[in-house]
Interface confidence: low
């Protein structure tokens, strides 16, 4: 099955790779923007250049294109703990990351939020700590992983998930005692 | 199967209070962090609250922090989201979801439910 192009895509698959379709004659294939420019006029005919401007303080194209208006840049999300890693230039959108020892857990494909790595206490790092996952840990004896920390199994409940890493342990325990009362 | 179930959304006055449950089922309720996250009108998903599996661990945004309080009942399998002083801007379709013990999301979201705030 051949996948279906949008009309835009159509349209530009006609005139070479850089150039694009007239809109208002098909006959003619206009030079596309640079990346950090925007497409003010079509190209008045064939051979002539396409009027291009560039964009404006806080707005950027990324690549070669025949956008009527520059795209908004980002603007970092404090809320999520974000930081700004590169600002915004006409040719680049901002590029916003965390602080040292920091992940970044994604909530959705564009939205992320920065957390603070996980420092294994009572237990040792399995991997560590990288940009989008945060650090795995493998708890001592005694400790089982909860929200990705090392609890102490005095704090494992019979209704939690906790009981089968923790049973090692309570064996033992009762092992100690049954010993005791032979 | 798993499913959520959110309610008592509703229209409510500028400074008003509502408190929105989000019943779960088809899943091991205990296992998971639970999350709530919004939708204002023409706007993108905006996180606003998480809970540790256990409760003992929860999260804000700045918008919300002081004003909304996320808490759940693993004994009925159900999340709540109480919102007090609210503003127009938190006029928004509420949705529950849920995450694993790693913060990384999961792949359930409920249908949501509407908060209007308006005088």
């Known amino acids: 099955l051949v996948p279906h192009l949008g009309d835009r895509e159509k349209r530009d698959s006609v005139c070479p790779q850089g150039k694009y379709i007239h809109p208002q004659n098909n006959s003619i294939c206009c030079t596309k923007c640079h990346k950090g420019t925007y497409l003010y006029n079509d190209c008045p005919g064939p051979g002539q250049d396409t009027d291009c401007r560039e964009c404006e303080s806080g707005s950027f194209t990324a690549s070669e294109n025949h956008l009527r208006h520059c795209l908004s840049c980002s603007k970092c999300r404090k809320e999520m703990g974000q930081v700004e890693i590169s600002s915004c230039t006409v040719d680049r959108d901002t590029v916003c990351g965390c602080r040292k020892n920091q992940y970044r857990h994604y909530w959705s494909e564009n939205l992320f939020q920065c957390f603070n790595c996980s420092l294994c206490l009572n237990g040792t790092v399995h991997l560590s700590c990288q940009e989008k996952q945060n650090t795995v840990c493998t708890c001592h004896a005694g400790f089982f992983l909860r929200e990705n920390e090392c609890v102490s199994c005095s704090n494992c409940k019979k209704s939690l998930e906790c009981t089968k890493l923790c049973l090692p342990q309570i064996e033992n325990v009762k092992g100690t005692e049954d010993s005791g009362t032979t | 199967e798993v499913q959520l179930l959110e309610s008592g959304g509703g229209l409510v006055q500028p400074g008003g209070s509502l408190r929105l449950s989000c019943a779960a089922s088809g899943f091991t309720f205990v296992k998971y962090s639970m999350g709530w996250v919004r939708q204002a009108p023409g706007k993108g998903l905006e996180w606003v609250s998480q809970i540790a599996n256990t409760g003992d661990r929860r999260y804000y945004a700045d918008a919300v922090k002081g004003r909304f309080t996320i808490s759940r009942d693993n004994s009925k399998n159900t999340l709540y989201l109480q919102m007090n002083s609210l503003r127009a801007e938190d006029t928004a379709v509420y949705y529950c979801?849920?995450?694993?013990?790693?913060?990384?999301?999961?792949?359930?979201w409920g249908q949501g439910t509407l908060v209007t705030v308006s005088s």
């Open positions: 979801a849920i995450y694993t013990g790693r913060w990384e999301p999961f792949v359930y």
